[in-house]
């Protein structure tokens, strides 16, 4: 039986049940290679409390559909008197990066995971030439996730004192230049994740090979190497390589530019101080507030919730968007869709789509940007579920009693962007983490 998601096959992936202190290792095409789980384990569970290992999914007992992968075992489990077998169930959804498997819940018999990934899309529009896992768990099982930094088109410019060269990078995947026909970037070879431009020539100085690694809990490392043979003539016989070290800052701050810290013989060392390198609980909340010692800030957007069936309305040319954030009030137009953001076609108001649901909510404050994300909306033709990204800005003189109003700023591949100036986005900082 062919592997259902070949792009995910090259790596052993990790997921964590934080509540129960359990680490799962997952290999969807082969076995995880952990002795304690046996030779054919595809999903190996490591209980850190009891220091025990259990195989909860066997690679031989795999069954797959386009959106669901199940690994059974021969181990019995007693669920309400019935004689079931322990199994793992991974639900796949279309995403814009390789993504990460997320632990959902576990019963006596079944371990459930969800995975938003390009591998599950109906079309190839989000697929990279080369992409590697872009997250890692530290020794305290806290997740550090750089997926939000991955650029689907374009690149980041590395800050370098050399006026004759420009070094462009992407994070965990190759640089896509198709949207930019005229710039220096267009000359970059396909597959490169680190592209050096000198004059009118562009050189591949690194492609992603291995996933993100953790050095210390505040330092993550990504390494790119030039795969093909054939040395570059300015590298003194050495093969080019790029090392990017992502550093979690010691206190809250605006984002910085990736900086070149060392270069010799085409070995480039880059340091990027960014809060995305911090553990995810420091940056994100499933509610509409971020506060406490954990996050070093106090943010509360709950006053933006609308009551009594009213919604914020944002004009998007062909569409009207109805938003009801930070609550669970149904939007009239999007009846029974559990939508936080509802898209209605102006020319045909019967065409209604959920552009993100209120129970699929993430509030993120990172590198000075405050963002509320609603995902899991109605599917587009690619298989990607519509989502909305609301970028908040502090405005102490916002209208509507300080609440302000969301402004639609555009759509990219079924992701809808809004900006929202409001006094409730004014962040109060604490001092250390």
């Amino acid at each position: 039986q062919a592997a259902p998601f070949p792009e995910l096959c090259s790596y052993t992936w990790e997921a964590v049940d934080t509540k129960n202190n359990v680490l799962y290792k997952i290999n969807i095409c082969g076995s995880v290679d952990i002795v304690q789980c046996g030779p054919s384990s595809a999903v190996c569970m490591h209980d850190l409390k009891t220091r025990t290992y259990h195989s909860v999914g066997d690679s031989v007992l795999r069954s797959a559909t386009r959106s669901l992968l199940e690994f059974n075992t021969t181990v019995s489990c007693d669920q309400q008197g019935t004689n079931h077998r322990v199994q793992s169930s991974i639900a796949f959804l279309c995403g814009k990066t390789l993504g990460t498997p997320e632990f959902v819940t576990a019963t006596e018999c079944v371990h459930y995971f969800e995975w938003r990934t390009t591998a599950a899309c109906k079309k190839d529009i989000f697929k990279a030439n080369k992409e590697v896992p872009c997250y890692v768990f530290d020794e305290e099982l806290r997740k550090h996730d750089l997926n939000p930094l991955i650029k689907l088109s374009g690149a980041y410019l590395v800050d370098d004192s050399d006026p004759d060269t420009s070094l462009f990078i992407n994070v965990c995947r190759d640089i896509d230049t198709l949207r930019d026909p005229g710039s220096q970037l267009r000359a970059c070879p396909p597959g490169t994740a680190a592209c050096l431009v000198r004059g009118h020539q562009a050189f591949d100085v690194g492609q992603p090979r291995d996933g993100l690694k953790v050095v210390r809990k505040d330092r993550l490392v990504l390494s790119y190497v030039r795969e093909e043979a054939g040395k570059l003539d300015f590298c003194d016989g050495h093969s080019p390589a790029v090392t990017i070290t992502f550093v979690c800052p010691s206190e809250r701050r605006e984002g910085t530019i990736p900086k070149l810290t060392a270069k010799s013989n085409c070995r480039y060392e880059i340091e990027w101080i960014t809060e995305y390198a911090c553990h995810r609980d420091y940056l994100e909340s499933k509610t509409c507030s971020l506060s406490g010692e954990q996050q070093d800030v106090s943010i509360d957007l709950t006053p933006l919730a609308q009551s009594g069936g009213s919604s914020y309305i944002s004009d998007g040319k062909e569409y009207l968007f109805y938003l009801n954030v930070c609550g669970e009030t149904e939007i009239q137009f999007c009846n029974k869709k559990q939508a936080a953001v509802c898209q209605v076609k102006k020319s045909d108001t019967s065409q209604v789509k959920a552009a993100g649901r209120y129970h699929n909510q993430t509030l993120r404050y990172s590198d000075g940007d405050l963002t509320l994300i609603y995902f899991g909306g109605d599917e587009c033709s690619s298989g990607f579920q519509r989502m909305s990204v609301i970028n908040f800005r502090c405005n102490k003189t916002a209208g509507n009693d300080g609440k302000g109003t969301p402004v639609f700023t555009g759509e990219v591949d079924c992701t809808y962007f809004f900006t929202w100036d409001t006094e409730y986005a004014c962040v109060h900082h604490h001092h250390h983490h």
């Epitope: 980041y156 026909p181 710039s183 900006t419």
Partner: nanobody, 123 residues
Framework: DVQLVESGGGLVQPGGSLRLSCAAS????????WGWFRQAPGKEREFVAA????????SYADSVKGRFTISRDNAKNTIYLQMNSLRPEDTAVYYC????????????????WGQGTLVTVSS
């Protein structure tokens, strides 16, 4: 790719104001970072201001900080440059440009350009 058309240039007295507009059409407006550049006679093209599409964060050349403001109206696919307290040294052709590179102020990293609009500051 993106097509860009600037407007709003003209003759203005020192201390005066102008608002430049840049109308964008073509590919997705929302995937680009936008910049204003200028080129005075006999000089190289220089960075003036930029705005990041994803968060509307802005950056400015030191020479225009506090006087110029870059903004955008996504509903109209238009970028603006509000220029206040204009000085004779601001005289130049002003260009609007689009880039898919983050954190750059280098004109060679901008792939799409308008034709430019002339701003003359003189009494």
């Amino acid at each position: 790719d993106v097509q860009l058309v600037e407007s709003g240039g003209g003759l203005v007295q020192p201390g005066g104001s102008l608002r430049l507009s840049c109308a964008a059409s073509g590919r997705t407006f929302n995937t680009y970072n936008w910049g204003w550049f200028r080129q005075a006679p006999g000089k190289e093209r220089e960075f003036v201001a930029a705005i990041r599409w994803s968060s509307s964060k802005t950056s400015y050349a030191d020479s225009v900080k506090g006087r110029f403001t870059i903004s955008r109206d996504n509903a109209k696919n238009t970028i603006y440059l509000q220029m206040n307290s204009l000085r004779p040294e601001d005289t130049a052709v002003y260009y609007c440009a689009a880039s898919i590179v983050d954190f750059t102020t280098n004109p060679s990293h901008f792939g799409s350009w308008g034709q430019g609009t002339l701003v003359t500051v003189s009494s």
